[in-house]
């Protein structure tokens, strides 16, 4: 509900500063509060615009302050207006000169329809002039000068709503600025009645509260609260939940409080008089000191709160036994809550006696919407109301109010909610690399839409066209490898960002699709690589019989060991060999092969081969003759790689014999590096030569080696290989 309060300080203007303060207590108006002159009540008042300023001591309050030199321009009627959700509330008040000839008994007077009413003005200045009375600026009555009484009265024996208005009194020679004002408020209904047709019964509005004729609710005087205004506020506080405070040294002294009709204006509890600067006499309390204490057990009467009941007693006169009521208090509610947009379950926790029920706890949104608890529980000391907002959004940011209203009183606690936008990546993740069972992803988590800071990141993935839930992995780096994927499967990927707080998971970002490779076919079997010429190598393999219908081909990769030269060749799948040409003579090549369909197959092991040589081979090196016996010896050697050496020839003869009497031993396996000569003669000197042969021809030995066999009985000997020049 809207709680609008207008403080008129002071209604009787002298040469002191005077002001009007309009307070929106416990709610946030949709439009600014306005303070203006009430021309409906008084047409011919001053036309000067008002200087309305923000009241710096309160969040939602406006103020007009008149300095003492402006006193002559102040007389008249004023209003304050506040609006929320299309509903407008207007509060009216007046200001008049303290030096006026007459002064009203009260600033406002609220009566019920049909009441017998006397509107009275006290004569403070005696003049030999007729007295005149106006209603809303129009003349209604005059009193001849010799008949002007001390108390000038307008009598309405049977008040009707149309009698309501601003009544003013002055001498005929005076003007607006010497007039006294009082406002009559006539409730549309008779006493204790409310409703459009005035045939519903009001609840009791205690402590001079007034029953609103349209809603049946009580409008409580400043200093009292609750559904029936039974509960006194803490000292010097006012408002529907008593959370506004009078900052003066003597509390609410000199503050005239004006509330929405039909309440009108009154002093705060404990004060009386037109200026609200007179304390109540002993035994009296309440607004304008109109309430009399009749404390049952002789309890003390407090002019602000009434009877101060002894422990175990309660009620206005301490007439009821029971645990004293305790004003509800809202606990454990932080001043500021950061909330992620989406579902929100605010909690309002309150103490008090009796404990608040779920009907008595509400939550008011910044736009004035009143929420009721979705869930409720209570312990011995606290009531806990849980509210549900299914979708809270950034526009819901602002001041929310937890409100508790029990028979023991009312309390409201505003708190600020800041609704954050959940983060969402602007870009889809990028696929850097894929295999048949893995993918390397750049998650592209920035830039993102929404609010940070980002607490964590998730990469979500799932096969397309599968009714599987999204799987996810927590990600810390921008580059991540997804493993254990299915081969030849289309996946979709997206990134979800998580910000701090409950429900911080943002909506997943844009989706990227990719397909894993098929599991590759095995490499060709029986691979063999042989030189064909100085510039060609021949690669052969066994025929391939694929298990699927898919087209396939053999990919052959060859690269030179000596040079950075690489070539990939595609060979139709029905072939079993490929000639690798345009090679360099006497060069070593590494070759591997795989069988590809749409997916790439597995590479074979590397095969190496040399192209045939374009020069004669070098002589074998490190020639040694060892293990010499009377009839045998072992010859060993090494050859250089890369000269297409196909065979080694060992030529030996008895020294001194003719050339044509030599024996040639041809070793056709060039990988063999030693040979045992057998059937030699004992104690005989042999001349031994060794040649390497390749496609060009034989190597040229620089010298021959000598071998002398042992006598028949001697142990074997090693010969370092004495050299004999040829």
């Amino acid at each position: 509900a809207m709680d609008l309060i207008l403080i008129n300080s002071l209604p009787l203007v002298s040469d002191a500063e005077t002001s009007l303060t309009c307070i929106a207590s416990g709610w946030r108006p949709h439009e600014p509060i306005t303070i203006g002159r009430d021309f409906e009540a008084l047409m011919n008042q001053h036309q000067d615009p008002l200087e309305v300023t923000q009241d710096v001591t309160r969040e939602w309050a406006k103020k007009v302050v008149w300095k003492r030199e402006k006193a002559s321009k102040i007389n008249g009627a004023y209003f304050c207006e506040g609006r929320v959700r299309g509903e407008a509330i207007r509060i009216r008040t007046m200001k008049m000169r303290q030096q006026a000839s007459f002064l009203p008994a009260t600033l406002t007077m609220t009566v019920d329809k049909g009441d017998n009413v006397n509107i009275s003005f006290k004569k403070v200045l005696i003049k030999e002039e007729d007295a005149v009375i106006y209603k809303n600026g129009s003349f209604i009555h005059s009193v001849p000068r010799h008949e002007v009484p001390d108390i000038l009265e307008v009598h309405l024996p049977h008040a009707q709503p149309q009698d309501a208005g601003v009544y003013s009194a002055r001498y005929i020679g005076g003007n607006l600025f010497t007039s006294a004002f009082t406002r009559l408020i006539v409730r549309r209904c008779e006493a204790q009645k409310w409703g459009p047709e005035c045939n519903h019964l009001c609840t009791a509005c205690m402590n001079n509260g007034v029953c609103h004729e349209d809603t049946g609710e009580c409008i409580c005087p400043p200093g009292f609260m609750g559904r029936t205004c039974e509960k006194a506020c803490e000292l010097h506080t006012f408002g529907r939940t008593c959370k506004e405070r009078c900052s003066g040294q003597e509390g609410c002294k000199s503050y005239v409080f004006c509330l929405p009709d039909p309440y009108g204006c009154s002093c705060a509890t404990g004060w009386k008089g037109l200026q609200c600067n007179e304390a109540c006499h002993p035994g009296f309390y309440g607004p304008d000191c109109k309430l009399r204490c009749s404390c049952n057990n002789g309890e003390m009467c407090d002019r602000f709160q009434g009877c101060l009941c002894s422990p175990g007693w309660q009620g206005l006169q301490c007439e009821r036994e029971g645990i004293p009521r305790m004003t509800p208090k809202i606990v454990d509610l932080p001043d500021h809550i950061e909330v992620n947009s989406g579902k929100f379950n605010p909690i309002c926790k309150a103490s008090g006696w009796p404990l608040p029920t779920n009907e008595e706890m509400t939550l008011v949104k910044p736009d004035g919407t009143v929420l009721h608890p979705k869930d409720f529980n209570h312990t011995d000391h606290f009531s806990v109301a849980i509210f549900t907002i299914h979708r809270i959004l950034p526009p819901d940011s602002g001041v929310w109010v937890c409100s508790v209203n029990t028979v023991a009183g009312m309390v409201e606690k505003p708190f600020n909610i800041s609704v954050k936008v959940l983060p969402k990546p602007l870009n889809a993740p990028n696929v850097i690399d894929t295999g048949h069972n893995f993918a390397v992803i750049n998650i592209s988590s920035e830039p993102y839409f929404g609010d940070g800071p980002i607490k964590s990141k998730k990469l979500l993935y799932k096969p397309v066209n599968h009714y599987e839930a999204w799987q996810h992995i927590q990600v810390t780096n921008e580059i991540v490898t997804l493993n254990y994927l299915e081969p030849r499967t289309e996946y979709e990927l997206c990134v979800q960002l998580v910000r701090r707080g409950e429900g911080g998971e943002g909506h997943p970002g844009p989706v990227r699709r990719f397909t894993t490779a098929s599991i590759g076919l095995p490499p060709p079997r029986g691979l063999n690589l042989l030189p064909k010429s100085q510039t060609t190598l021949n690669l052969t393999w066994q025929p391939i019989f694929p298990s699927s219908e898919d087209d396939f081909y053999v990919e052959v990769e060859r690269r030179s060991v000596q040079k950075s030269d690489q070539q990939n060749i595609k060979v139709p799948g029905n072939l079993t060999s490929v000639l690798l040409n345009n090679l360099h003579p006497r060069e070593q090549y590494v070759v591997r092969a795989r069988v590809n369909t749409k997916a790439q197959g597995e590479w074979s092991e590397d095969l190496t081969a040399w192209t045939l040589s374009d020069i004669l081979p070098p002589q074998p090196e490190n020639i040694k003759i060892s293990n010499i016996t009377h009839s045998s010896a072992v010859i060993s050697w090494t050859i250089l790689d890369g000269y297409s050496i196909s065979s080694i020839t060992i030529r030996y003869k008895v020294q001194g014999k003719n050339e044509d009497q030599h024996v040639d031993v041809k070793i056709k396996n060039a990988t063999i590096t030693q040979y045992q000569l057998k059937g030699l003669e004992p104690e005989t000197a042999y001349q031994v030569d060794i040649f390497a042969e390749n496609n060009i021809g034989s190597s040229n030995p620089a010298f021959s080696h000598e071998l002398v066999t042992l006598p028949e009985s001697q142990a074997p000997a090693d010969l370092g290989g004495g050299k004999m020049l040829l």
Epitope: G195, P196, H200, T215, E230
Partner: antibody, heavy 117, light 113 residues
């Protein structure tokens, strides 16, 4: 917790009288107007009577006017409905209730009255 | 007296579906001065007293789930349950409090289809 506990129901012959009571707790009973509403078996709700918080004002449905009397004892937090010259059409579940504005917010558990010969 | 007429008399709706109950008053219950409709809705389960759901035609009472909503103005009003739950099976009544005596509709029985 606000509670309204009803008593006094039963079976009664046509033309006889019966008194229903409603005891209130958890609220300042003396501050609230109180209503009686009834519901005939298998039928809808029918408002019967209302009394102001101080007992000064009382209103009745035409169907019970002159036969039923609503009263209250604020010192005992008690509401009563004195039903005289009962008729068979008065057979119903009777509820006491507290208003929230013009809606009825808190209801008693109900008490069954059967008027039968 | 203002007459209140509800329609339909009974209604069967599947769980999770929307249920709509109408209420018509013989004269307007909208008060132009404050633009409020003086209409309330109640739910009554077997063997229990009625439970206030809505007042001022569209203001939800404390503790009432937000699947219940009230709308309408003047003479035509609607109570809507956006997604019917098993516990919503009951009789629903509208009531005007524009004028005394307060009067109720004849009730609408809501069941699960």
């Amino acid at each position: 917790q606000v509670q309204l506990v009803q008593s006094g129901g039963g079976v009664v012959q046509p033309g006889r009288s019966l008194r229903l009571s409603c005891a209130a707790s958890g609220l300042t009973f003396a501050n609230y107007a109180m209503h009686w509403v009834r519901q005939a078996p298998g039928k809808g709700l029918e408002w019967v009577a209302v009394i102001s918080y101080d007992g000064e004002n009382k209103y009745y449905a035409d169907s019970v006017k002159g036969r039923f009397t609503i009263s209250r004892d604020n010192s005992k937090n008690m509401l009563q409905l004195q039903m005289n010259r009962l008729r068979s059409e008065d057979t119903a579940v009777y509820y006491c209730a507290t208003p929230k504005g013009g809606a009825l917010e808190i209801w008693g558990q109900g008490t069954v009255i059967t008027v039968s010969s | 007296d203002i007459q209140m007429t509800q329609s339909p008399d009974s209604l069967a709706v599947s769980l999770g579906e929307r249920a709509t109950i109408n209420c018509k008053s013989s004269q307007s219950v909208l008060y132009s001065s404050n633009n409020k409709n003086y209409l309330a809705w109640y739910q009554q389960k077997p063997g229990q007293p009625p439970n206030l759901l809505m007042y001022w035609a569209s203001t939800r009472e404390s503790g009432v789930p937000d699947r219940f909503s009230g709308s309408g103005s003047g003479t035509d009003f609607t109570l809507t349950i956006s997604s019917l739950q098993a516990e919503d099976v009951a009789v629903y009544y509208c009531q005007q409090y524009y004028s005394a005596p307060i009067t109720f509709g004849q009730g609408t029985r809501l069941e699960i289809k």
